[in-house]
């Protein structure tokens, strides 16, 4: 997990400012609308699981 | 640190109801979707129940074989949740455990309640 | 349902050496990006302990003699070197949809 402004996150996950750390971006098929998500360079989110 | 601390469980006659709590503390509890998992030796571990976030309109999500038996709540201005159990059967007996998640895995977990549903 | 299949149930392995458990799921269970399965360790009188998130990250704090593997429907976790505080029992888990089902668990022995 990184502070904002020091080394990026892993490959595979974004800042969150909402959780105040590293996210996984695979989470963003669950949770497309989560403040980490745009910052993911991963394809467009698969169909939201029920 | 990261704690989920549980109450509830104990022995509960067929038929009868039981409500457990998990108070959360060391992380944004309002984020995070909640799910009550338990573990019996014929069953293994059993995914239960599940009440998501504010931001998913606090959908809830059932086993098959809860439904219409279990509800569970929260409350996030006391980072807490909670999972009522009615009509319990035989088959309801074992550990729970409270337990949260981003989205897919268990990352935090409760130490487990057992319950046990017996005449 | 999907439906996880876990084998071996129980496996002895000598100190030191590789332990490798494998699960499978009843259907796919990965995009073309991620695999939605995890892996946890469970010791007795324990709740589980995530070790692995989406089939080969490794959760934060695990020691890197963890790994795991696999995509679609097969999965591997591999412990090497095996080390004495490894005896627990390992779960596999699918997030791809509701309901979340566990694998039934292997009981890894340190010999």
């Known amino acids: 997990e990184q502070a904002p402004g020091t080394a990026p996150c892993s490959r595979g996950s974004s800042w969150s400012a909402d959780l105040d750390k590293c996210a996984d971006c695979a989470s963003c098929r669950a949770r497309p609308h989560s403040d980490f998500c745009l910052g993911c360079a991963a394809a467009p989110p698969a169909p939201f699981r029920l | 640190q990261v704690q989920l601390q549980q109450s509830g469980g104990g022995l509960v006659q067929p038929g009868g109801s039981m409500k457990l709590s998990c108070i959360a503390s060391?992380?944004?509890?309002?984020?995070?979707?909640m799910s009550w998992v338990r573990q019996s030796p014929e069953k293994g571990l059993e995914w239960v129940a599940e009440i998501r976030s504010k931001s998913d309109n606090y959908a809830t999500h059932y086993a098959e074989s809860v439904k219409g038996k279990f509800t569970i709540s929260r409350d996030d201005s006391k980072s807490r949740f909670f999972l009522q159990m009615n009509n319990l059967r035989a088959e309801d007996t074992g550990i729970y455990y409270c337990?949260?998640?981003?989205?897919?895995?268990?990352?935090?977990w409760g130490q487990g309640t057992d319950l046990t549903v017996s005449s | 349902d999907i439906v996880m299949t876990q084998t071996p149930a129980s496996l002895a392995v000598s100190l030191g050496q590789r332990a490798t458990i494998s699960c499978r799921a009843s259907?796919?269970?990965?995009?073309?990006?991620?695999?939605?399965m995890h892996w946890y360790q469970q010791k007795p009188g324990q709740p589980p302990k995530l070790l692995i998130k989406y089939a080969s990250s490794l959760e934060s704090g695990v020691p890197a003699r963890f790994s795991g593997s696999g995509s679609g429907t097969d999965f591997t976790l591999n412990i090497h070197p095996v080390e004495e505080d490894d005896t627990a029992t390992y779960y596999c888990?699918?997030?791809?949809?509701?309901?979340?089902?566990f694998g039934g668990g292997t009981k890894l022995e340190i010999k």
């Open positions: 888990q699918h997030s791809w949809e509701i309901p979340y089902t």
């Open positions: 259907q796919s269970v990965s995009t073309s990006t991620y695999s939605y």
């Open positions: 337990s949260s998640t981003y989205a897919d895995y268990f990352h935090y």
């Open positions: 060391g992380f944004t509890f309002s984020s995070y979707w």
